[in-house]
């Protein structure tokens, strides 16, 4: 009986109601691979997501999020909130990153701007709530014989606002 | 696909130093948040702290903090977690996890044994 | 920094259904999430948000967060859903995530 099953080609079930012959996956459901004995239920793109392929006999649809979220987790299980940048998502939605953090992207969460001070720089690009601030040289970095070694890390200050 | 590969299991004696390691592929590892989380045997799990490697910010549970230091190298896609003195209290499963709130993807654990 | 205090352990017949709550200070001021780790396995999200649940998580799992409590909800539960189940939230005090204790699923 078992070899009989293993003939089932993806997109049928073998049907032990009816002797093990291989029945066409019913309407919604789909079987990636052979000798199945049950079809799996297409997954449905609702809600926050949207389909980006349909579900066919042999693969399972795929899903995105729609505008305004961004996937999560595998094949897109999770759907969450974007906001802008310059800001964070918290459970009474976006907000505005505190003053002296920011954020680049249209996820995520604030951090603080660079300490240009903690590495011995001076700010020569202030910081904003989209952007990190630009650290240029200290006067000592201008003086004739200064060294050119690599600056370290940029520094922040501990426990400094978000995150 | 996404995913975090963590280095292998160690078996250290106190007092000597430790860096494990979290390699992320599949996804633009620069701008997400990588935590890394500590299980010890039988118990729960506790965040540490987390980077963003695109900068190496750094934030940490007061918990730990002091006790240990996240670091990253987004050149090659790697977070890591380091000790520079273990202790027989540090024996426990550690996590690398994207994500600040959520975590979406997991690395598979890096057993750590601290044992004299 | 907030702490969430779970049940050690709950047990449910199958087929009932499983209560497990998380409770801290102003909880429902912030999204709560859970997960759930099986023996050898890392956790695994099944409720995301407070209440949302990711795709591939079966209909059965559920949650709320209001108040003090979160709460995961499993109705009808079944033997494979005997696990570990963990609460946590992400706090903009201490910009840090915090898990509660774990609460151990069995299916008796």
């Known amino acids: 009986l078992q070899d009989l099953c293993s003939n089932c080609p993806a997109g049928t079930f073998c049907d032990n109601n009816r002797s093990q012959i291989c029945s066409p996956c019913p309407p919604n459901s789909f079987s990636s691979a052979g000798g199945q004995r049950t079809c799996d239920i297409c997954r449905q793109c609702k809600g926050v997501f949207k389909t980006r392929k349909e579900c066919s006999s042999t693969s399972n649809a795929e899903c995105d999020c729609i505008s305004g979220y961004h996937c999560l987790g595998a094949e897109c299980s999770m759907c969450e909130q974007d906001c802008k940048q310059g800001q964070e998502l918290t459970k009474k939605g976006c907000k505005d990153c505190c003053f002296g953090t920011f954020n680049d992207q249209k996820r995520g969460i604030c951090r603080p701007w660079t300490n240009c001070s903690l590495d011995g720089k001076s700010v020569l690009v202030n910081g904003t709530k989209e952007r990190d601030v630009v650290c240029g040289p200290s006067p000592a970095d201008l003086s004739p014989g200064a060294s050119s070694a690599t600056p370290p890390a940029p520094a922040r200050e501990p426990g400094h606002s978000p995150q | 696909q996404v995913q975090l590969v963590q280095s292998g299991a160690e078996v250290k004696k106190p007092g000597e130093s430790l860096k494990i390691s979290c390699k992320g592929s599949?996804?633009?590892?620069?701008?997400?948040?990588i935590s890394w989380v500590r299980q010890m045997p039988g118990k729960g799990l506790e965040w540490m702290g987390k980077?963003?490697?695109?900068?190496?910010?750094?934030n940490y549970s007061p918990s730990f903090q002091g006790q240990v230091t996240i670091s990253a190298d987004k050149s090659i896609s790697t977070a890591y977690l380091q000790w520079s003195s273990l202790k027989a209290s540090d024996t426990a499963m550690y996590y690398c996890a994207r994500g600040y709130g959520i975590f979406d993807y997991w690395g598979q654990g890096t057993l750590v044994t601290v044992s004299s | 920094d907030i702490e969430l205090t779970q049940p050690p352990s709950v047990s449910v017949a199958p087929g009932q259904t499983a209560r497990i709550s998380c409770s801290g200070d102003?909880?429902?001021?912030?999204?709560a999430h859970w997960y759930q780790q099986k023996p050898g396995q890392a956790p695994v999200v099944v409720i995301y948000?407070?209440?949302n649940r990711p795709s591939g998580i079966p209909e059965r799992f559920s949650g709320s967060n209001s108040g003090n409590t979160a709460t995961l909800t499993i109705s009808g539960t079944q033997a494979e859903d005997e696990a570990d189940y963990y609460c946590s939230t992400y706090t903009f005090v201490g910009f840090t995530t915090v898990f509660g204790g774990g609460t151990k699923l069995t299916v008796l």
């Open positions: 102003n909880i429902g001021d912030q999204y």
């Open positions: 948000q407070d209440k």
């Open positions: 980077i963003y490697p695109g900068d190496s910010y750094t």
């Open positions: 599949g996804y633009s590892f620069s701008t997400y948040w």
